[in-house]
């Protein structure tokens, strides 16, 4: 699986999950989130071979496609699998609020 | 909808689905698919800027991201939405095989 | 050059399941459908069933239909041939076999080195 | 299922002869142009390897001492001058009709 786990301990150039920090107010201008200040969202980039972890029957026609065809710009690209909640918490008024945003730290990625 | 009602209409720059025809023989190297000799597959092209068809929250938050950090090589990718089988004829030797494949024609798109 | 690379020999019980593996190379694994073909001691060649690995579609022989599953795995470009219900007379060697290409039946121009399944209580 | 029928089931012949094998199939195997039929060559041990498709084409790095003849339902392989390699087992095999089947085998032995 293109996970944390293989990508980041290897040099792969194909599709994998990247290191990406987000601060929360500096690279989105949220300045109302107390904690965490940023997160380890991650990022899924690579090229997406012939064979290379594809998703569905149509990448991997795609891929087999490109291989046959190097020049077009019909290929399929390098996008997250499996998506992780991030808890936060914010202040309403004086009141703590803790919420879990849904889908915020890609663990996986796949070619679609 | 990012599907081929608008974008096969309109000159969409961002993702949006694109008109691709597969030919079995000359374009996967496939020559035992009595029918169809290709297919229209259809192909996901195009930028993905904020609030564009996002389809997750990571993917918004990756789209804001980029948005404030332009270079970045992390953005959200123009990737198959709706999928839709197609039905195939083969010969099995002399006996007319129809089988249905699942997930091979792009209907619509998504940045993901 | 093509090469099919398959598993090594296996000494199974009757009831058991065997499940032999052939690993593919140079060529594009997922334009060909793949065979398996067996061969009892001392027989002729018997046909088993076949794949299309990009697809995942099989044509299995009658003989076969509800015993075996034949599968690929195209980020390694192995296919596999599971045989469940082993009895005695399924003792053979079990060869990989590539079709040339032009029908889902066809001639079958590149085969592995075979793998010897043993049945004995 | 097609059954294939070769004859015969093993010969002797001497290095420099001309060798003749056949194989019947139950029915015929011809089809939009074609003829359906293979020939194979298996030395003991080894994998079956492809000498002859669609009746007489030659397969390619195949000595052309091999040759293949026939439509319909009889077909021929032929060896116009034996060499010491080629004493091995030799299989028809049609694919006109799923399940896919082969003749029985001849053996070829040095007299």
């Known amino acids: 699986a293109l996970d944390t786990n293989y990508c980041f301990s290897s040099t792969e150039k194909n599709c994998c999950v990247r290191q990406l920090y987000i601060d929360f107010r500096k690279d989105l201008g949220w300045k109302w989130i107390h904690e965490p200040k940023g997160y380890h969202a991650n990022f899924c980039l690579g090229p997406c071979p012939y064979i290379w972890s594809l998703d569905t029957q149509y990448s991997k026609v795609l891929a087999l496609y490109n291989q046959h065809n190097p020049g077009a710009s019909a290929a399929p690209c390098c996008v997250p699998q499996a998506l992780e909640p991030l808890p936060i918490v914010y202040y309403v008024g004086r009141k703590p609020k803790v919420e879990q945003l849904s889908n915020m730290i890609v663990r996986s990625c796949k070619c679609s | 909808a990012l599907d081929t009602n608008y974008c096969f209409s309109s000159t969409e720059k961002n993702c949006c689905v694109r008109q691709l025809y597969i030919d079995f023989r000359k374009d996967l190297g496939w020559k035992w698919i009595h029918e169809p000799k290709g297919y229209h597959a259809n192909f996901c092209l195009g930028p993905c800027p904020y609030i564009w068809s996002l389809d997750t929250q990571y993917s918004k938050v990756l789209a804001l991201y980029n948005q404030h950090n332009p270079g970045a090589s992390a953005a959200p990718c123009c990737v198959p939405q709706a999928l839709e089988p197609l039905p195939i004829v083969y010969y099995v030797g002399r006996k007319p095989k129809v089988e249905q494949l699942s997930n091979m024609i792009v209907r619509s798109c998504k940045c993901s | 050059q093509v090469q099919l690379v398959q598993s090594g020999a296996e000494v199974k019980k009757p009831g058991a399941s065997v499940k032999v593996s052939c690993k593919a190379s140079g060529y594009t694994f997922t334009s060909y459908w793949m065979n398996w073909v067996r061969q009892a001691p001392g027989q002729g060649l018997e046909w088993m069933g076949q794949i299309f690995p990009a697809l995942g579609s099989t044509n299995y022989g009658e003989m076969f239909e509800g015993r075996v599953t034949m599968t690929t795995d195209t980020s390694t470009s192995t296919a596999y041939m599971e045989l469940r219900s082993l009895r005695s007379d399924d003792t053979a060697v079990y060869y990989c076999?590539?079709?040339?290409?032009?029908?889902?039946?066809?001639?079958?121009?590149?085969w592995g080195q075979g793998t010897l399944v043993t049945v004995s209580s | 299922d097609i059954q294939m029928t070769q004859s015969p089931s093993s010969l002797s012949a001497s290095v420099g002869d001309r060798v003749t094998i056949t194989c019947r199939a139950s029915e015929s195997v011809d089809w939009w142009g074609n003829s359906f039929m293979h020939w194979y060559q298996q030395k003991p041990g080894k994998a079956p390897k492809l000498l002859i498709y669609l009746a007489s084409n030659l397969e390619s790095g195949v000595p052309s001492r091999f040759s293949g003849s026939g439509s319909g339902t009889d077909f021929t392989l032929t060896i116009s001058s034996l060499q010491p390699e080629d004493f091995a087992t030799y299989y028809c095999?049609?694919?006109?009709?799923?399940?896919?089947?082969f003749g029985g085998g001849t053996k070829v032995e040095i007299k």
């Open positions: 095999q049609q694919n006109i009709e799923d399940p896919l089947t």
């Open positions: 076999a590539r079709g040339i290409g032009n029908y889902a039946l066809d001639a079958m121009d590149y």
